[in-house]
């Protein structure tokens, strides 16, 4: 039960990339307004985005606190202009997010190919380690800093002249890999969490080839 | 060459918390690799405790995660084992190890290439 | 967890004789994730091989492992006096990371 003017939100989503987490739920306000509690398993209940008439609530700083933990979340509804009113049981409508652990469920972002260098036969490739913004001692920790060797990558290429592709996987962010002399190869590649079982991978990185700035060529 | 060694008490009484450091000289415990626990009981074979990384990533054997923590301190370039609720299943030989990067097909994979002596630990009363 | 079976758990040899140590797994491991440790009595374990047939630093090439999937080798091709010993396989591709119950090589 709640106010007459007032509806319970629904449709309570985690939308998360590397660490970067928002809930989003629906309806678009109609005289009414909305504020977002969020608390780990055993811990309080901590406000956020007070009498918002946004859908969306940016909860990033309270899980980066410790992305190994379980957050429920919950969306309250106010009567617009009269945030005090509640429901017949004495408190306003409110509605219960799933449950969120960021470090099994946050979405690895799409991956960058930071650089490839030619030597000889072998070209080096390097991905781009990207910062989170999880925090520790001050810093902001890279999605290797955080989720350490549960993180590989995947790396996909071919002769730019063929469509075979050849696959290496690494549990750091350097692949060196044997490639045919005075051919072009082009890169791509992913992140995978093989522990998972739900959003185990990212979307592929953009294409990158050999011939084109990004890369190095030595020949030795 | 890196050098690890082990330190902390040779008994601990049952229920206590058992507690190890093992000290990195020459080189950086910040320098990319991982650092790990790894357990002896006598006579028998070696059993993996768990893991860390510079940034204080932790990767535990499920069989002990309710009782241990390992932790870094990049500042001293140590990193420590506790092991809550002892019991005399827990009197072992603690190594501490380092885990390299090496290469194979193609990328590059963690192997505990280097090792401390070993310190014994013995859970009595 | 996966588990990781060494046969003979005993193997008894003369010095120059070939060793032929196994290593089964209850289910697949990548080749990748899979090393080969000497331990001496008093000492700590010794990386020689890494990737399943890499010979890791300073390890002498009568070392040699092989194998792959389910089933890993370790041959010594020609037995040294201070190669009797006891050697481990261990995977690192799950946690938690395991070792076989050890195959000790005895001067027979």
């Known amino acids: 039960s709640g106010t007459t003017n007032t509806v319970a939100a629904y449709n309570l989503t985690w939308k998360s990339t590397n660490f970067k987490t928002i809930l989003e739920w629906e309806p678009k306000p109609v005289n009414q307004v909305y504020t977002v509690q969020i608390s780990t398993k055993s811990g309080d209940w901590k406000s956020k985005c007070f009498y918002t008439t946004d859908t969306e609530c940016d909860l990033t700083d309270e899980i980066v606190k410790d992305v190994k933990q379980t957050y429920l979340a919950r969306v309250f509804s106010y009567p617009a202009g009269n945030v005090e009113s509640t429901g017949s049981a004495g408190e306003p409508l409110y509605e219960n997010s799933p449950e969120f652990t960021p470090y099994l469920e946050t979405n690895l972002g799409q991956p960058t190919i930071q650089s490839f260098e030619q030597v000889g036969t072998k070209v080096n490739v390097t991905v781009e380690d990207e910062r989170t913004l999880v925090r520790r001692n001050n810093t902001f920790l890279s999605l290797r800093d955080v989720f350490g060797k549960d993180l590989i990558y995947t790396l996909y290429y071919w002769k730019s002249s063929s469509s075979g592709k050849k696959t290496a996987k690494t549990n750091t962010n350097e692949f060196l890999i044997d490639v045919d002399k005075g051919e072009n190869y082009c890169f791509s590649v992913q992140a995978v969490i093989p522990s998972r079982t739900v959003n185990r991978k990212s979307t592929d990185s953009p294409v990158e080839c050999m011939g084109q700035e990004k890369g190095e060529f030595r020949e030795i | 060459q890196v050098q690890l060694q082990e330190s902390g008490p040779g008994l601990v009484k049952p229920s206590q918390t058992l507690s190890l450091t093992c000290t990195v000289s020459?080189?950086?415990?910040?320098?990319?690799?991982?650092w790990s626990w790894i357990r002896q009981h006598p006579g028998k074979g070696l059993e993996w405790i768990g893991e860390i990384y510079y940034s204080g990533s932790t990767r535990y054997n499920p069989s002990l995660k309710s009782r241990v923590t390992i932790s870094v301190d990049t500042s001293k370039n140590q990193f420590s084992l506790k092991l809550s609720s002892v019991t005399a299943a827990d009197t072992a030989v603690y190594y501490c190890?380092?885990?390299?990067?090496?290469?194979?097909?193609?990328?590059?994979?963690?192997?505990?290439?280097?090792w401390g002596k070993g310190t014994t630990v013995t859970v009595s009363s | 967890e996966i588990v990781l079976t060494q046969s003979p758990g005993t193997l008894s040899l003369s010095p120059g004789e070939r060793a032929t140590l196994s290593c089964r797994a209850s289910q697949s491991v990548s080749s990748s994730y899979l090393a080969w440790y000497q331990q001496k009595p008093g000492q700590a374990p010794r990386l020689l091989i890494y990737g399943a047939s890499s010979r890791a630093t300073g390890i002498p090439d009568r070392f040699s492992g092989s194998g792959s999937g389910t089933d890993f080798t370790l041959t010594i091709s020609r037995l040294e006096p201070e190669d009797f010993a006891v050697y481990y396989c261990q995977q690192v591709g799950v946690v938690p990371y395991t070792f076989g119950g050890g195959t000790k090589v005895e001067i027979k």
């Open positions: 020459g080189g950086s415990i910040s320098s990319g690799q991982y």
């Open positions: 190890a380092r885990d390299a990067p090496y290469y194979y097909g193609g990328g590059y994979y963690y192997y505990m290439d280097v």
